[in-house]
């Protein structure tokens, strides 16, 4: 017959039927099924089917009445052209039905990988995602959700390039792979974190430095009035979105911030969208960026901050070295230190005179004087950017008698 072959798709390991529309009252002499390479089976009414090809034994059947061919446990080698030759009783003409069988594998879960990120001067970036299915052949079609009009698909849909700014909501992208017998969707992929690095295109931008005290609140001041044109403010710490304030209540990004009390610790001011952090932790220190997003333009304006977190200094402790006496001159080293003060602590001593000399980052005071000479009390003050704390060392008679002549 002249019509195109009927296309039938089957799944690897599954079953398929090549259907013949032979009515029940048609008197059949015999039906011969011919496979991709040679004759497969011969069927006559009221007789057992004769299977002629070894590889089809136990996998091939011909249905009664309709003489359709059923193949089970499909292999990739079963794909190809099939032909049924139908001989009717009292008919001299043999009618033929042709089929093309395709055998496809069940798709595995598609994997989405990020191929590239290009960050531009205006903080927008082009992110290229690639979707692939392990072991899949060319017959796989790919599609993406959401199917944005401004996104571009290439390589048969397997590559998606999206343009976004930190102002855009961090939507999940899903790749769906499809072949004629199966469909699989990928895990959702969030691309927002790839587009929140303001240093990626121009080196780290300088901004305002804010100093905070461990355990106390701090505000990163945005100092602007939200207008009708302001859509939202996105606050980014390092490269993670921590707050996406949308005209009203702040909504913490639930993928990156813990729920509960931690979520309430960081919030934005309803008045000017400044970032307020209560109960500062040392790990809160670092670069912050506020992207002020406008309804009118996709390009945000950006404010940069560096948050430094210091501990309030405890009272310093003063220790003295063993006294060293030689030729009637006493020498002692006083050391001032603060527990857990960190590396940003400086020290000063009072009073300073020619007999007392500071050394080693000012934490040590070298004192020398004549035996019996009156010594003042010395005060050590520890300083860091958020606090000062002092301790007095009472000199007393630390070098008054001959029993102290040796170390």
């Amino acid at each position: 017959k002249d019509s195109a072959p009927t296309v039938v798709s089957g799944i690897l390991g599954g079953s398929v039927t090549l259907p013949l529309n032979i009515s029940v009252d048609t008197e059949i002499e015999n039906v011969i099924w011919i496979g991709p390479k040679n004759a497969l089976a011969f069927a006559r009414p009221k007789e057992n089917v004769t299977i002629m090809v070894k590889s089809y034994l136990g996998r091939l059947d011909i249905t009664k009445w309709s003489y359709s061919l059923c193949i089970s446990n499909l292999t990739l080698n079963d794909a190809g052209s099939y032909k049924a030759q139908i001989n009717q009783r009292n008919f001299e003409v043999t009618t033929e039905e042709e089929f093309t069988l395709f055998v496809y594998e069940q798709l595995q879960e598609p994997q989405v990988t990020m191929k590239s990120v290009k960050v531009s001067e205006n903080f927008s970036c082009n992110i290229t995602l690639m979707c692939s299915v392990k072991g899949a052949e060319k017959s796989v079609l790919y599609s993406w959700t959401p199917r944005e009009p401004h996104a571009s698909e290439s390589n048969g849909g397997s590559i998606l390039t999206v343009s976004r700014t930190p102002c855009d909501p961090d939507l999940p992208y899903i790749c769906t792979a499809q072949n004629p017998v199966s469909q699989r969707s990928s895990l959702p992929v969030h691309v927002g974190q790839f587009c929140t690095d303001p240093g990626a295109s121009r080196g780290t931008a300088a901004g305002k430095t804010v100093v905070g005290i461990l355990g106390e609140p701090v505000t990163l001041p945005l100092e602007f009035r939200a207008t009708r044109a302001t859509k939202n403010v996105v606050w980014v710490f390092n490269t993670s979105v921590i707050s996406q304030e949308r005209r009203g209540a702040a909504t913490a990004d639930s993928r990156r911030k813990p729920k509960g009390s931690e979520e309430r610790r960081v919030r934005t001011s309803d008045q000017d969208q400044s970032l307020k952090i209560s109960q500062l932790k040392m790990e809160d220190a670092g670069p912050y960026h506020a992207y002020v997003c406008s309804e009118a333009s996709r390009d945000p304006s950006v404010r940069h901050f560096t948050l430094l977190v210091y501990k309030r200094l405890e009272k310093p402790s003063v220790t003295k070295s063993p006294v060293h006496m030689m030729n009637g001159i006493c020498e002692v080293v006083l050391t001032c230190s603060v527990d857990g003060g960190g590396n940003n602590v400086t020290y000063t001593w009072m009073p300073l005179q020619n007999k007392a000399v500071m050394s080693q980052g000012k934490s040590h005071l070298n004192v020398s004087w004549e035996s019996g000479e009156h010594l003042p009390n010395f005060t050590c003050t520890a300083h860091n950017p958020v606090s000062n704390s002092s301790s007095q060392f009472s000199s007393g008679t630390i070098c008054s008698g001959p029993e102290r002549n040796k170390r």
Epitope: E109, R147, E148, R184, P188
Partner: antibody, heavy 116, light 106 residues
Framework: QMQLQESGPELVKPGASVKISCKAS????????INWVQQRPGQGLEWIGW????????YYSEKFKAKATLTVDKSSSTAYMLLSSLTSEDSAVYFC?????????WGQGTTLTVSS | QIVLTQSPAIMSASPGEKVTVTCSAS?????MFWYQQKPGFSPRLLIY???NLASGVPVRFSGSGSGTSYSLTISRMEAEDAATYYC?????????FGGGTKLEIK
Amino acid sequence: QMQLQESGPELVKPGASVKISCKASGYTFTHYYINWVQQRPGQGLEWIGWIFPESGSTYYSEKFKAKATLTVDKSSSTAYMLLSSLTSEDSAVYFCARGTGFFDYWGQGTTLTVSS
Amino acid sequence: QIVLTQSPAIMSASPGEKVTVTCSASSSVSYMFWYQQKPGFSPRLLIYDTSNLASGVPVRFSGSGSGTSYSLTISRMEAEDAATYYCQQWSSYPPTFGGGTKLEIK
């Protein structure tokens, strides 16, 4: 035969919570996203959110973030939607639907009535 | 979110008549999807990717359009086509539906 079978109608009091189920059959449950859609009486359709049974990942419409919680039980190929703090505004038919991009198969719908 | 506006909201057609339902998007979308819903039933997918017929849908249904303007056409109205028709987009989150067009038989 591909099918999404939803649980029966519910009549609950304001302030209560309700859990609707959607049992999938005839396909591999973990391979497809399950969406939930609300249809209020005489109204159109509104998307609530999706869950990916493979991983349990969820995504919600801003409007339903505080209202709906989506979960799945892979062993029984069943998706669930918990609706909390119910008011009369939540009275609607809730559909589960399969797919990404569009919804190729739908459940028959669960009618929820919130009334004191 | 993208708002989809369908028109007309209600219409009636005689058997054999050509019917066109339009769907206008508040901003550009890549593809449109169409569903049919009969009273007491769940929606049924008719058209996917703007113009592709879903499995088992009669060929008298067709879809077309691009950008912000899309349409669903029934070439020859039949009694069983009386239903409400919804358009849907998923070019951005959240996916949204049109308000529906109720099609009655004359």
